[in-house]
């Protein structure tokens, strides 16, 4: 009798262990599925948010702080206050961002459109020559590629011309102490899928 009970007990434990193993595998499979679904949801949310943002130039789903412009993977703010290059650097840092970095042609087109001014205001970029006459570097240390734009050496600047400003789509090296407007950029956050929630009562009201 004791042996039989013990045997039944063994069977039950084995079955439980097997069930536990199966459940554990199911759980792992569900976790993988969950990660995939979350990724898909994120992708769809970003695509939809981008469309909504493109239509209006603003939307609550935007991953950028209010008043900051969403372009590509970044958020940008073009400020009207004029500062030295270094003051712009610290100002951007205080805004949890860095100075404008132009990585590709579309970024240059965007920056030119945003900074264009009939009053010839120019904007500092994050490009500088840490050592006069040496290589141009972005603030994060990456080298500048001359394929992207031509830097005009501004001979009117009295001192060293080691900082770079954008003026109406043209790029000039300037004295870093000159006062120019600041452009700050920061990486865009993740689009929150819940920020796309449309209250039922608004459905059917236009697009």
């Amino acid at each position: 009798q004791y042996y039989q009970l013990s045997n039944t007990g063994q069977d039950t434990i084995s079955q439980m262990e097997e069930r536990l193993g199966n459940t554990s595998q199911e759980l792992q499979s569900l976790q993988v599925q969950n990660i995939k679904l979350a990724g898909s949801l994120q992708h769809v949310a970003e695509k939809l948010c981008r469309e909504l943002y493109n239509k209006a130039g603003a939307h609550r789903c935007s991953p950028c702080t209010e008043q900051w412009k969403w372009h590509g993977d970044n958020c940008y703010q073009f400020y009207k206050d004029s500062k030295s290059w270094e003051d712009c650097k610290y100002f951007c840092l205080s805004e949890n961002s860095t100075m404008l970095k132009i990585n590709k042609q579309e970024d240059l087109e965007f920056a030119a459109s945003q900074s264009y001014s009939e009053f010839f205001y120019s904007y500092w970029t994050g490009l500088l020559r840490p050592d006069s006459g040496k290589a141009w570097l972005w603030m994060d240390g990456t080298p500048f590629t001359s394929e992207l734009f031509h830097i005009i050496i501004d001979v009117t600047s009295p001192r060293s011309r080691d900082c770079v400003a954008i003026l109406n789509g043209m790029i000039f090296s300037k004295d870093c102490k000159e006062l120019k407007r600041c452009v700050c950029e920061r990486r865009a956050g993740m689009v929150k899928p819940e920020s796309l929630h449309v209250p039922p009562e608004t459905l059917g009201e236009g697009d």
């Epitope: 943002y53 493109n54 130039g57 412009k69 969403w70 372009h71 042609q105 579309e106 087109e109 965007f110 030119a112 459109s113 945003q114 264009y116 009939e118 394929e147 992207l148 734009f149 031509h150 005009i152 109406n168 789509g169 043209m170």
Partner: antibody, heavy 117, light 107 residues
């Protein structure tokens, strides 16, 4: 994908007005300016000016000051070119092109305006 | 205003030929020059900016060079689809101006 779709061809009488539209899609309209370029039949390209899509402020090339007006409706991502007191010499294809006044990566398909009595 | 002058105004060539179009600015525009290709009844197609930087999707047989006032567009080996009109345009401030165009025809 990025597209600029312009309104269809127009046939107008001298003295009339015309309004050409350019609807943008596939990007944030207010992130890039919009330019207008004219091409008379068998002729080259002429930059007419541009409009800042953030501020709505237009800038006109000297030859296009007066009868030419650039405007926007940002709610529908559309730029407009209006020409008043049409003359025979306004007969041309008008293109919209995206960007600040620099180089133009994206162009509309063009709108032909014919002015004839 | 900056004047842009292209030469020649027309050019006949055969498939496989190497072709060069020149563009001259009335004053220095540094490297602020763009090139476009236009086919009849179509809008211009952006080829090059910054005198030498190829737009994405443009075949590598196209190349640009020059700075200051003298610029060239070279097609290293003409393809049937390259027969079109080519325009240069400065982007060194406003007003923007275009060259009068170079029509590239089949010989």
């Amino acid at each position: 994908q990025i597209q600029l779709v312009q309104s269809g061809s127009e046939l107008k009488k001298p003295g009339a007005s015309v309004k050409v539209s350019c609807k943008a899609s596939g990007y944030t309209f207010t992130n890039f300016g919009m330019n207008w370029v004219r091409q008379a039949p068998g002729q080259g390209l002429e930059w007419m000016g541009w409009i800042n899509t953030n501020t709505g402020e237009p800038t006109y090339a000297d030859d296009f000051k007066g009868r030419f007006v650039f405007s926007l409706d940002t709610s529908v991502s559309t730029a407009y070119l209006q020409i008043s007191s049409l003359k025979a010499e306004d007969t041309a294809t008008y293109f919209c092109a995206r960007g600040a006044p620099a180089w133009f990566t994206y162009w509309g398909q063009g709108t032909t305006v014919t002015v004839s009595s | 205003d900056i004047q842009m002058t292209q030469s020649p105004s027309s050019l006949s060539a055969s498939v496989g030929d190497r072709v060069t179009i020149t563009c001259r600015a009335s004053e220095s525009i540094y490297s602020y020059l763009a090139w476009y290709q236009q086919k009849p009844g179509k809008s211009p197609k952006f080829l090059i900016y910054n005198a030498k930087t190829l737009a994405s999707g443009v075949p590598s047989r196209f190349s640009g060079s020059g700075s200051g006032t003298d610029f060239t567009l070279t097609i290293s080996s003409l393809q049937p689809e390259d027969f079109a009109t080519y325009y240069c345009q400065h982007h060194f401030g406003t007003p923007l101006t275009f060259g009068q165009g170079t029509k590239l025809e089949i010989k």
